[in-house]
């Protein structure tokens, strides 16, 4: 193109991208007419006054990436037409004031993943149309009272994964329009009662990944429009009762990694919307009955990594929506028969890495839809006549790693499992655990009559066969949460997280992990 | 190759909403106007808005103002238009569309449309 | 902003020239060289054949060509053949940063 820089390319005559590391200023001349220009991954450690006054039909200006340390006040001067400025991935520690003086325009601003030190209400006080503003990944410890009252249409503001020890209760009540507030990764230790009370319209805060104890009993009770609310990896030890009050919106709740001992009945709710609840990595060691009866549209409920050993009848009332429920990895003994009963939807049910003897056999009876069952790694030793029978739609079934005793009573066990193999899986087997002389051997080909020779068995099949359905898909939708790949962080949909790795250690977890938290 | 795969067809009552996804594969997402354009049966293009997804912040058509969200998801590559209050005028092909740099001012790759129908 | 304006339908022979008017204000069209031309067939999506007022595309016929004359736009494709016929759009960005398409034109090849 006719007028493009030489170091730069230009792919429209109004599109301008300069980039490597032979560029140490800004490119001239500039094309007059530039809509946009991005300058990526150079050498540029400052800009100077005005290195852009000759475009000022400018709309998006991305320096990213590149060594700048300093920029003049006036380095933007006669940019009126400004819309989106990205200064992500640089080097500054400080903003000189006035710097966005006259970006009239201006609505997204990308300062993330600087050195920024401090921030002060002067250096965003002209910016009245910004509507997004991003300032995480700085070194920002604390943000002064006034810094945003002037950014009254902002709808977007992360601060995350910075140094913050405190919030002012102040520092957010002019920011009516804002919609997603990320706070995660900082030093916060508790949040001040009135903080988000300005916060009408938020529909996500995020604020996983701070240090907070305890949380305010009224402290979200103005934010009706709340969709996602992430609390995980902090130090919360208990819920004050009506802390979700206010919450009628909320479909997604992350308290993972937390310290919560116990959830008081009504602690939930009401919220009619929550899709999602995610409290595995506490230390929660028992569910009362109707904990979370106001939880009518909940699909996954995660709560495994706890100390559970009790878990009353009426636990799940109320959950009839609910498709997933991960109880793996507690200290579970018995279970009641009815514990299940209300969960008609249910689809799929880890149960793994807990201490259970024995299971009731009515324990999957109104659960016609069961489509997985973990049970390894337990103390199992038989399981009751018929307790698979109703449930056409189970394709995966984990017993392995269970203590079975392979005597007479294991037969009807064993033809079951002989007719529904494909079920089991190939990776592991269920193996007898005694007698002694047939330790080690498949539950599947063992012959009873030589485990156990002085008692006559009759092969009579007790569990009749339930058909088995290759083309039944395991987890017929992409929310499942299956735990032979569980996902132990709900990925929280924004893109500022560490990026998502999964390993697949079935042996102990059998989960996806996620850095985020 | 730049690819935009978008989601099924969808039928819907008058005043509720849809969403359209559009998945970006080939290229970088992040640095490029995603634009929304629909096409009512035996009608013309008629551009509703566009969104940079690293920028966040969408631009809309005057005629769909308030009544169109778009938004984009930089980790799933995926673009979204959500049009709510649905009225029988709005059934049409939706088309995500993008250009070859930051800015569209043309539209070089558009998806396959989605056929939305509002009906009661 | 109000589409562009197109006329509904142009006709020719094989082997003809014709061209296609897009017609706007000094907002758009006039006000900006980023005028662009859309190929549609039928159950298609659109097709970009020309750019910047009068930039092919790799790939596209070199029969197609683009022009711009004050507030109005011309597209003319040369050298007519069957495979031609289809909808034409023009697209002008505007001056409040947005996009704008024309009505549409129907190219019939006799």
């Known amino acids: 193109y006719h007028g493009c820089p030489s170091e730069c390319t230009c792919s429209r005559a109004s599109q301008v991208e300069c980039t490597g590391a032979r560029i140490v200023a800004v490119p001239t001349p500039l094309p007059w007419n530039a809509m946009s220009l991005q300058i990526l991954n150079t050498h540029i450690t400052e800009l100077n006054e005005s290195p852009f006054l000759n475009i000022s039909a400018l709309i998006a200006l991305r320096i990213e990436k590149n060594e700048l340390s300093r920029i003049t006040p006036g380095a933007f001067r006669n940019l009126g037409s400004l819309r989106y400025l990205s200064l992500a991935n640089n080097k500054l520690q400080v903003l000189p004031i006035g710097l966005f003086q006259g970006l009239d325009s201006l609505e997204s601003l990308l300062l993330s993943s600087n050195q920024l030190l401090q921030i002060q209400p002067a250096h965003f006080s002209q910016c009245s149309n910004l509507k997004e503003l991003q300032l995480h990944g700085n070194h920002l410890e604390y943000i002064p009272d006034g810094a945003f009252d002037h950014l009254v249409g902002l709808t977007k503001l992360n601060l995350g994964k910075n140094s913050l020890t405190h919030i002012s209760p102040r520092v957010f009540q002019h920011l009516g329009n804002l919609q997603v507030l990320r706070l995660y990764e900082n030093r916060l230790t508790d949040i001040p009662m009135g903080t988000f009370d300005g916060l009408v319209n938020l529909q996500e805060l995020a604020l996983q990944q701070n240090q907070i104890g305890l949380l305010s009993p009224g402290l979200f009770h103005n934010n009706h429009n709340l969709q996602r609310l992430y609390l995980s990896n902090n130090h919360i030890s208990q819920l004050p009762p009506s802390v979700f009050m206010q919450l009628p919106q909320l479909n997604r709740l992350t308290l993972f990694g937390n310290s919560l001992k116990e959830l008081s009945p009504g602690i939930f709710g009401p919220m009619p919307n929550l899709r999602e609840l995610w409290l595995y990595d506490n230390h929660i060691s028992s569910l009362p009955d109707n904990v979370f009866s106001n939880l009518r549209q909940l699909q996954v409920l995660i709560l495994s990594r706890n100390q559970i050993s009790f878990i009353s009848p009426g636990a799940f009332n109320g959950l009839t929506e609910l498709r997933e429920l991960s109880l793996h990895t507690n200290a579970l003994q018995d279970l009641d028969g009815n514990v299940f009963r209300m969960l008609a939807n249910l689809q799929n049910i880890s149960l793994q890495n807990n201490r259970l003897r024995q299971l009731p056999g009515n324990i999957f009876a109104n659960v016609n839809g069961l489509m997985a069952i973990q049970l390894q790694n337990n103390q199992l030793e038989n399981l009751p006549l018929g307790i698979f029978d109703h449930l056409g739609k189970l394709c995966e079934l984990r017993l392995y790693d269970n203590p079975w005793r392979c005597d007479s009573d294991i037969l009807p066990l064993r033809n079951w499992l002989l007719l529904n193999q494909p079920r089991l899986g190939t990776d592991t087997v269920p193996v007898c655990f005694s007698p002694a002389n047939v330790r080690g051997q498949s539950l599947i080909i063992i012959n009873v009559n030589v485990a156990v020779p002085s008692v006559h068995v009759p092969e009579v099949p007790s569990y009749p066969e339930t058909p088995w359905y290759p083309d039944t898909p395991s987890y017929p939708d992409t929310t499942s949460v299956s735990s032979t790949t569980e996902l132990t962080s709900p990925v929280e949909d924004y893109t500022d997280l560490t990026t998502i790795q999964v390993t697949d250690d079935r042996s102990v977890w059998g989960m996806t992990q996620a850095q985020s938290g | 190759q730049v690819q935009l795969v978008q989601s099924g067809a969808e039928v819907k009552k008058p005043g509720s909403s849809v969403k359209v996804s559009c998945k970006a594969s080939?290229?970088?997402?992040?640095?490029?106007?995603i634009s929304w354009v629909r096409q009512a049966p035996g009608q013309g293009l008629e551009w509703m808005g566009g969104?940079?997804?690293?920028?966040?912040?969408?631009n809309y058509a005057q005629k769909f103002q308030g009544r169109v969200t778009i938004t984009a998801d930089e980790s799933t590559s995926t673009a979204y238009m959500e049009l709510s209050s649905l009225r029988s005028e709005d059934t049409a092909v939706y088309y995500c569309a993008r250009g070859v740099a930051l800015l569209a001012t043309d539209f070089d790759y558009w998806g396959q449309g989605t056929l939305v129908t509002v009906s009661s | 902003q109000s589409a562009l304006t197109q006329p509904a339908s142009v006709s020719g022979s094989p082997g003809q020239s014709i061209t296609i008017s897009c017609t706007g204000t000094s907002s758009d069209v006039g006000g900006y060289n980023y005028v662009s031309w859309y190929q549609q067939h039928p159950g298609k999506a659109p097709k970009l054949m020309i750019y910047e007022v009068s930039n092919r595309p790799s790939g596209v016929s070199n029969r197609f060509s683009g022009s711009k004359s004050g507030n109005t736009a011309s597209l003319t494709i040369s050298g007519l053949q069957a495979e031609d016929e289809a909808d034409y759009y023009c697209q002008s960005w505007t001056h409040d940063n947005s996009v704008v398409f024309g009505g549409g034109t129907k190219l019939t090849v006799l």
């Open positions: 969104i940079i997804p690293m920028f966040g912040t969408a």
């Open positions: 080939g290229g970088t997402f992040s640095s490029y106007t």
